[in-house]
Structure formats: C-alpha cells, structure tokens
C-alpha cells in the first residue's frame, strides 16, 4: 500500500499556504483527486509529489494515491482543508445527476472542519427542503440525499454558520432521473388507412415515457416529416404527440408511415400503410371452395371475406333454392371485423337437412356498388338400395335401384344359404357393375342408378345381394328366392313378393 507524507488523515492549512503531498510506493504511483487550480505534479524516483505554493479554498478535497501495478489495488488518502474565512464551501459540481432511489451526493466540501456543527442543506432562495427528504453530511464529501426521488430534482445550497450568520455555497442542481424500463411506448393511429383521392386523412403518432428525455418522429417512406409536436404529462408519464393532417390526399401521400421514438434505453418503431385509391371499391372472396359438398346431418360454416372502402351500407345472406323459399335465419349469420377495411361474414348451417341443399348467396353494398358471392351446397347421402325380381324380354332379371350422392357403385353377390347379408365364406360369385344406368341426376339431388342381373334360373337355397357404396357409406338388399316366389331382404325389414 502506498504511503502519503504527511502521514495524517487530514491536513488543515490557510489560504496562500504551501502544501506538499508526497506519495511513496513500491512501484510507480498516481495521485487522484478533484481537478482544481494551482497544483503541480512531479515525480521523484518511486515517489510522486503533488504541490501548490498558493493553496485556495478550491484545493479542499480528498487526494488519493494508488499504485497502478498493485493487483490488490491498495490506496492511501489524505483530506486537505484550506480554511478560508470568506469561503466555507468548495463546491465540486454545478449539477449532480442520479437515478431515482440512488443516493445523491451534493459535493459541498467544508473548508474548515470546525464549522461542521452548524451546517445544513437548503433549497435555493432559502426555501426549506421538501418533506421526507432524508439526508446526511460528511465534511469530506458533502451532503447525501438518501434514496433520492424525482420530485427532489431541485437547486440546492449548502449552508454553514459563521460568526452567527449563515453563509451559503453556490447552488448545485440535482437532477433525479426516472429509472427508464425501456424505450418509449408507441401508438400509431390508425393501423391502416385507405382514402379516395381528394378526401381528408389524419395520422397520429404518439409516444410516452416516465422520463421527459426522449425523441419521437413520424416518417413517410423513410423521409422524416416536419410536424409540430404536442407535449403533455398525465398518469405520471410524459407524452409527445405528432398529428399529420392531410386535407386532400393524393397518390404521393400513399405509402409506409413509421412512428419512431428513442431514449437512452433504445428505439421503438411501429408502421402503418396508407393506400390512396381512385374510387370506392368492394371485393368479396372466400378461402373456401364455392362448390361445397357436406354429408346430410352435418354442419357447415360459409365464410366470405369483404374488403371495402368506404364501409358497407348493407349486406345479407340469401338462399336461392331450389328446394324451398326459406331464408337463412339472421341469428345464424355473424360478422367479424378483422380491421377497418376487412370483414369476415359467416353463415352457420348446423345439422343440414335435405331441403337445405342449394345455392347460398352473400350480397354486400357500398358507395362503389354491390357485389355477390354464391356458394353451391350439395348434400352427400349414403346409398339406399332396393331389389325386385322381374322379367325383361322374357328373361328373369334382378333389378337393383340405388340412390345416394355421390353416385353409388353397384356390386352383386351370390351366396349359399338364406342370409340377410352375404359373408365371405358363403360367397359363390361376385359381379361388379362398372356402368349402372343413371336414372336421375339433378343438381343438389341424390343420384339414382339401376343395375340389372339376368338370372336364367333362381337357385332356391341361395341369396342374391345387391350392394351399393359411395364415399359416405354403403347400403345393401338381399333377395332370397322361395318356392312360392321371391323373398327379398332389405337390411332392416322383410318384404314378400308373390
């Protein structure tokens, strides 16, 4: 550890005195202290000498000697008082900047230790300290305001009692800064803007922070706009607002607008897009296919996306047939706004009935005209099957009618024994009918097909089954010949034909 001569913790001298402070260490040593006048510094071997031959009150302070090469960083210090009867204070700062809840040291150094008993801290012009100001004093360092608050940002003076009268120091401005959690908070309104050429528009960029020291600007396509700033303070936050008013927009006003705010913690920015159009527009679209197929009994939501400016003047869902003149219930239609110019309209069709197949149209209107988007809804049905025995051109024929949607495929099976449904073990023969005759095929209806199986002789201890299937399901009908005629077995009921 370096050694200072004179080897006293503090030294008291009069103005004009010669002061020599010598520091000796094992290696090179350095003096550190408040920058002040009249000092000269010189080296003498392994010692460093700080001296003045004309000490003034401004040399009052703590001088520390360190050994830069010492890994333990040892140091020695001496405090010098230059007691000037006219100058009880040496003030080392014009201002002190700290963050809230830090201790704020106001560096009023007492030039005469004898005066310590009569010191106090006041605000300028003799005003008392604010309530709850907790402070302490050190003659070496000055006044410390503990856990300083933003509201204590004031101009202070140090007061000393000299010969019965108070002598004030020059003032020190204390700036207590709010602890800033991050860059300023931003809002840019609107998030998106569309206007027809010639209309008026307004874009508002605002930023707020707990600290007043922040900048905000609005830029258009990377060009900073010169807009007067409005400032406000509420809810313990400083607010700065930039409002861009355009009386008659033109195409050059279109583009990207960015609101940017920055402080010591960094930068925040948010952007919006401004579209200028020649005239009103109304666009309808759907992410869904306009041709929909749904199984009967299931539900469906029809969704239409609307992009429009100006806003819609009217909209509705209409059922265009063909089954009935019913109209969708209003409670099944709802609208959600994605943003100012885009909306989604949904028609909910729960537990679809056969009579609800057909065309559904969404109509919307704005000053640009009206538009419609039509969905075609076809219901899917599992096949229904029936078989009859008949003679065609003198030949015995089994006739199978299958009805469903999509169009069913038909397969004939011949199996041994009498059964409601042929299983694999019983099957004697299988015929696929790749091209059954289409009996009816109308839009939004079931497709009915017919398949013929010519049988020369009906085997009495056998079953003939017609099976039909499509993507929804399957159906079958079993035909059992009996001596009295033919016996048919639908899947879940008995029918007798003579």
């Amino acid at each position: 550890i370096p050694v200072i001569e004179p080897s006293v913790p503090e030294l008291v001298v009069k103005p004009g005195a010669t002061v020599t402070l010598r520091c000796v260490g094992n290696g090179s040593v350095e003096w550190d202290g408040p920058p002040s006048p009249h000092w000269t510094l010189y080296s003498d071997g392994s010692s460093s000498i700080l001296s003045t031959n004309n000490a003034t009150f401004q040399n009052t302070g703590t001088y520390r000697c360190t050994e830069p090469g010492d890994p333990l960083g040892g140091s020695a210090a001496i405090h010098l008082y230059v007691k000037d009867p006219a100058r009880p204070w040496n003030v080392l700062a014009q201002e002190v900047v700290v963050f809230e809840d830090q201790d704020a040291l106001l560096p009023c150094l007492l030039t005469d230790p004898v005066l310590e008993a009569g010191v106090s801290l006041v605000r300028v012009r003799g005003r008392p300290l604010m309530r709850h100001t907790n402070y302490s004093f050190s003659p070496w360092h000055g006044f410390t305001i503990h856990r300083a608050k933003f509201i204590q940002s004031q101009d202070y003076q140090c007061s000393a009692l000299m010969g019965g009268r108070k002598v004030m120091s020059i003032s020190i401005r204390l700036k207590v800064q709010k602890v800033i959690p991050g860059p300023p908070a931003l809002t840019l309104v609107p998030a998106e803007l569309v206007r027809i050429r010639g209309e008026a528009a307004q874009i508002v960029c605002s930023a707020s922070s707990v600290d007043v020291n922040f900048d905000v600007f609005l830029q258009h396509n990377n060009t900073k706009l010169a807009i007067p700033q409005q400032s406000d303070f509420h809810n313990n936050r400083y607010q700065k607002v930039l409002t861009l008013n355009l009386d008659q927009v033109d195409f050059q006003h279109a583009g990207n607008y960015s609101c940017v705010a920055s402080n010591v913690q960094g930068k925040h920015s948010t952007s919006m897009f401004f579209r200028v159009v020649e005239s009103a527009y109304l666009n309808l679209s759907s992410e869904q296919n306009l041709i929909q197929e749904v199984t009967v009994g299931e539900g469906l939501n029809l969704k239409v996306m609307v992009e429009a400016y100006p806003g819609l003047q009217g909209f509705n869902w209409t059922y265009l047939g063909p089954f009935s003149d019913h109209q969708p219930e209003p409670k099944l239609a709802n609208a959600t706004t994605k943003d100012t110019y885009r909306h989604t309209f949904t028609l909910s069709l729960p537990r679809l009935k056969p009579s609800e197949a057909g065309r559904y149209s969404f109509l919307a209107r704005n000053p640009g005209g009206w538009r419609a988007l039509t969905f075609e809804l076809t219901l899917r049905y599992p096949p229904e099957v029936s078989v009859i025995w008949t003679f065609i051109n003198g030949s015995g024929t089994l006739l199978c009618a299958a009805s469903g949607y999509p169009q069913p495929n038909v397969t004939w099976l011949q199996c041994s024994g009498h059964t409601d449904r042929c299983d694999e073990a019983q099957v004697l023969q299988v015929w696929d009918d790749p091209y059954p005759e289409v009996l009816s095929q109308e839009p939004f209806h079931k497709v009915t097909v017919q398949s013929l199986l010519t049988v020369e002789t009906l085997e009495h201890n056998q079953t003939y089954e017609c099976r039909a299937h499509n993507s929804v399901g399957s159906g079958s009908w079993a035909f059992i010949p009996i001596s009295a005629g033919a016996h048919t077995h639908p899947p879940d009921e008995f029918l007798f034909t003579p």
Epitope: E30, P34, P35, P37, T40, T66, Q94, E95, V96
Partner: antibody
Framework: QVQLQESGPGLVKPSETLSLTCTVS????????WSWIRQPAGKGLEWIGR???????YNNPSLKSRVTMSVDTSKNQFSLKLSSVTAADTAVYYC???????????WGQGTMVTVSS | QSVLTQPPSASGTPGQRVTISCSGS????????VNWFQQLPGTAPKLLIY???QRPSGVPDRFSGSKSGTSASLAISGLQSEDEADYYC???????????FGGGTKLTVL
Amino acid sequence: QVQLQESGPGLVKPSETLSLTCTVSGGSISSYYWSWIRQPAGKGLEWIGRIYISGSIYNNPSLKSRVTMSVDTSKNQFSLKLSSVTAADTAVYYCARDRVGMTFDIWGQGTMVTVSS
Amino acid sequence: QSVLTQPPSASGTPGQRVTISCSGSSSNIGSNSVNWFQQLPGTAPKLLIYSNNQRPSGVPDRFSGSKSGTSASLAISGLQSEDEADYYCAAWDDSLNGPVFGGGTKLTVL
C-alpha cells in the same frame, strides 16, 4: 492499460440532440474524473465538461445550458448529450481522463459528429 | 477565439531546436501549471508535458517545458520529421473553474 473509446451517431440534424458514450476499458471508471473535449475541423480544442462517479458534473459555462452528462458504473461508461445542436457543433468529440495536476493524460481516439440536415 | 494565445505556425529543419510560446493571464497561466499536448495528423491529442516541465513516461527528453509569469513555452531540440504535428498548450483557468486551451501551433519540419 486504461483505454477510452467514444461511440455515437456521426450525423445529427440541426435542433436535435447529439448523444455520445465513452467506454472505459482496462481500468475502473470509479476513480478519477472524466472529461469531454471537442475540436472543430481545423480549429483548436474546447473543454466541454467533466463528470465524477457520483454523478457530479462541472461544465464549461459557454455550453452549460445545453450539456447533460451521466455515468453508468455497471457498464464502465460515461455519456454526453448536447441539445439544440447547430452546424457550429460539428467537430471531433473526445473523451479523456482528468487527473489532478496532470489534466487529460489519456484520450479516446475521437468521433466525428456532423450537424447537417 | 482561444483563451491562451499561440502562434499559428512554426517550422524548423531536422536537428534544429524550435520553441513554441503560449501566452495567458493571471487567472490561468499566471497562477496555474501548464500542460502541452501533441496532436499528430488524424490522431487524438497526447499529453506531452504536464505541470510546466514534467514529461510522462515514454516522452523523449528532446521535449521540455517552462513557465514564466503569464507565459509558457515548449522547446523541441534535435527536431525530427515525426515531430511534425499540432501542439496545444492548456492551463486551469480560475474564472472558468476548468481547463482552457491555446489555439494550437502547426509545426512543420522542413
């Protein structure tokens, strides 16, 4: 070996605030006073002000009302803000260590700041 | 306008001795010690002389400083081409309560 490094934007628009930071490496900011000095192109040096670890600041009276300084011990940095800048503030800005009896014994390499629209 | 006055330029040939003057007042040089800085082209200033006549380690003894009254001077003996630089004097100013600089002297080695 203590070293200083200035950083900040090289271009500032008139009437805006110039912000610079000086990072101290190879030693602690906790000892010594630290100063800012500037030098307009082809001209002499001008002392702006000094700051101490406690946040004590003393500025050149000619700039005092426009200057704000702060210190961040956790980052070993001190900073300068100069508000309402004009073209006259265009200069190379230096940070330096300010020692008693040995003013400005260590300097940063300087950063050029141009004030222009 | 700088507080301390220096000649704008000085010159000398290699090996010569050159002196640069710095004039102030009682509030600066008259009552405070003087520092000198060397600024090589395109670089930051470097402390050359402190406390009137003290050299930091690494500064050649060709450089010396002196002070008398309200004036100070920097002498460079055995001038070398690498000494071509700007030289600034500085001193504490009691009225400013901080340092003031001279306007700088451009030294040319012919």
